[in-house]
């Protein structure tokens, strides 16, 4: 039950995380105009991975796509790549994890196969989350560097008469969405990996066997013994946590008329 819950929760958390990564990647507000020096600007600039936008006080918003590929900064290209890799890995991970869910039965899929698929999806989610976090962090670092560079030459005076204010950019909402989403995907992946350990068919119970002593015959029922191998007649791999509990297909040995103590 705990394994199913962990796996299910891991799946849901990862799903939310990947949805967040997709949202962050599509969002236009990766960097927004810093309003510290001009809080009452009538023109507000913000930029995303795919286009830059200008929102005017009038209510008009104009967005222009980055129609060049070669003219874009290498860092921006790297961030795009990291986010796309994160989305692709996350999407594949989601697809794999759907089939790996313990609550979903697909044919006669072995628990070992589900465990492997859970582990695979977990690793994919972890890598996906790391890609998103890395992408967002690279962009944030780029912003910080540019921010201080533009602060250093904030005002370029023309004969000391005219001020040309350079637009500075700060962290946009997409960065925070990306960080949180990447973190959630990472957590979901870890949960899937933990669930995989619980799913792995490494704990098989021996069937109850009657041991007849030479003197007084007593039936010994070794309830909670575990086998370290995957072999044995109990193919259903049902776990026995309670020593006295029996699996459905367990053969019970009834005492014979000579077995009274």
């Amino acid at each position: 039950m705990a394994v199913t819950a962990c796996q299910g929760l891991g799946f849901v958390v990862s799903l939310i995380g990947i949805a967040g990564i997709i949202a962050a990647t599509c969002m236009d507000q990766w960097s927004t105009q810093d309003l510290y020096n001009n809080p009452v600007t009538a023109v507000f600039n913000y930029q995303g991975l795919w286009r830059s936008c200008v929102r005017e006080s009038s209510g008009f918003t104009e967005c222009r796509g980055y129609f060049t590929l070669l003219g874009l900064p290498a860092m921006l290209q790297a961030v795009r790549a990291l986010m796309i890799v994160g989305i692709v890995l996350g999407a594949i991970g989601l697809l794999v994890s759907i089939f790996a869910l313990k609550c979903i039965r697909i044919g006669s899929m072995e628990d070992s196969a589900k465990a492997n698929m859970t582990l695979t999806s977990g690793i994919m989610f972890i890598v996906s989350g790391l890609c998103a976090i890395a992408g967002v962090s690279v962009f944030a670092n780029m912003l910080v560097t540019n921010f201080w560079m533009s602060t250093a030459n904030m005002y370029t005076g023309m004969g000391g008469m005219v001020q040309t204010v350079q637009t500075r950019y700060t962290f946009g909402a997409a960065l925070f969405v990306g960080w949180v989403a990447g973190g959630l995907t990472l957590i979901g992946g870890v949960m899937m990996c933990i669930a995989c350990r619980g799913l792995a068919p490494e704990e098989t119970n021996y069937k109850a066997v009657s041991y007849h002593a030479s003197g007084h015959s007593v039936a010994y029922k070794p309830g909670g013994f575990k086998a370290s191998t995957g072999f044995g007649s109990n193919t259903k791999n049902k776990k026995i946590y309670d020593g006295g509990a029996r699996t459905e297909d367990e053969v019970q040995s009834y005492p014979s008329k000579h077995d009274y103590v």
């Epitope: 105009q33 001009n38 009452v40 600007t41 009538a42 023109v43 600039n45 913000y46 930029q47 830059s52 936008c53 200008v54 005017e56 006080s57 009038s58 209510g59 008009f60 104009e62 222009r64 005219v162 001020q163 040309t164 204010v165 350079q166 637009t167």
Partner: antibody, heavy 118, light 113 residues
């Protein structure tokens, strides 16, 4: 056709109050930022106040801050300017304007005259 | 606040003449985000509200005759009327639309000789 009609102007004593209204029609009122611009006799236009389409952003000229209040009622397609503690220098023709591309005042009303005099 | 300085304050012209008026801002009106200059030109005739002529420094408002041309970038802007007509006699104002408060120039009055 875009139409802006101002009303509520008149003669008021210094220190008095007045509420101007601007009825808008012919466009999606809730989609545009609106402003009040005034023009004193034989002077150039002076921007007074601005309100964004959703009333999220509101700005005033330093000369009227604390005395004037701009508001809008999108359901009624109406813009308001509540003026208090009026001074003689507030005497002007008050125009209601709809913002357009480039934050320009694309459409203007015919104006309402406000006279502050003892 | 951005200060807008217009020159000359008045112009006396003859019909058909080419007219140029200047507007200077104390700060650049060029927005780096879209490379547009947030400067607007208005025409005001006596007893009427101002009328929008040009926005983004050079984009003509629909319905405005093509004899009106706006140019310039950053801090220096010009309004040119290629061939002045009698109906063009008015006061022309430039306005900063880049940063609040929106500020107007003192105007250039166009008069007939």
């Amino acid at each position: 056709e875009v139409k802006l009609v101002e009303s509520g102007g008149g003669l008021v004593q210094p220190g008095g109050s007045l509420k101007l209204s601007c009825a808008a029609s012919g466009f999606g009122f809730s989609d545009y930022g609106m402003a009040w611009v005034r023009q004193a006799p034989r002077k150039g236009p002076e921007w007074v106040a601005f309100i964004s389409n959703s009333a999220y952003s509101i700005y005033y000229a330093d000369t009227v801050t604390g005395r004037f209040t701009i508001s809008r009622e999108n359901a009624k397609n109406t813009l308001y300017l509540e003026m208090s503690s009026l001074r003689s220098e507030d005497t002007a023709m008050y125009y209601c304007a709809r913002l357009g591309y480039g934050n320009s005042f694309a459409y203007w009303g015919q104006g309402t005259l406000v006279t502050v005099s003892a | 606040d951005i200060v807008m300085t217009q020159s000359p304050s008045s112009l006396t012209v003859t019909a058909g003449e080419k007219v140029t008026m200047s507007c200077k801002s104390s700060q650049s009106l060029l927005n780096s985000g879209n490379q547009k200059n947030y400067l607007t030109w208005y025409q005001q005739k006596p007893g009427q509200p101002p009328k929008l002529l040009i926005y983004w420094a050079s984009t003509r408002e629909s319905g405005v005759p093509d004899r009106f041309t706006g140019s310039g970038s950053g801090t220096d802007f010009t309004l040119t009327i290629s061939s002045v007509q009698a109906e063009d006699l008015a006061v022309y104002y430039c306005q900063n639309d880049y940063s609040l408060p929106f500020t107007f120039g003192a105007g250039t009055k166009l008069e007939l000789k």
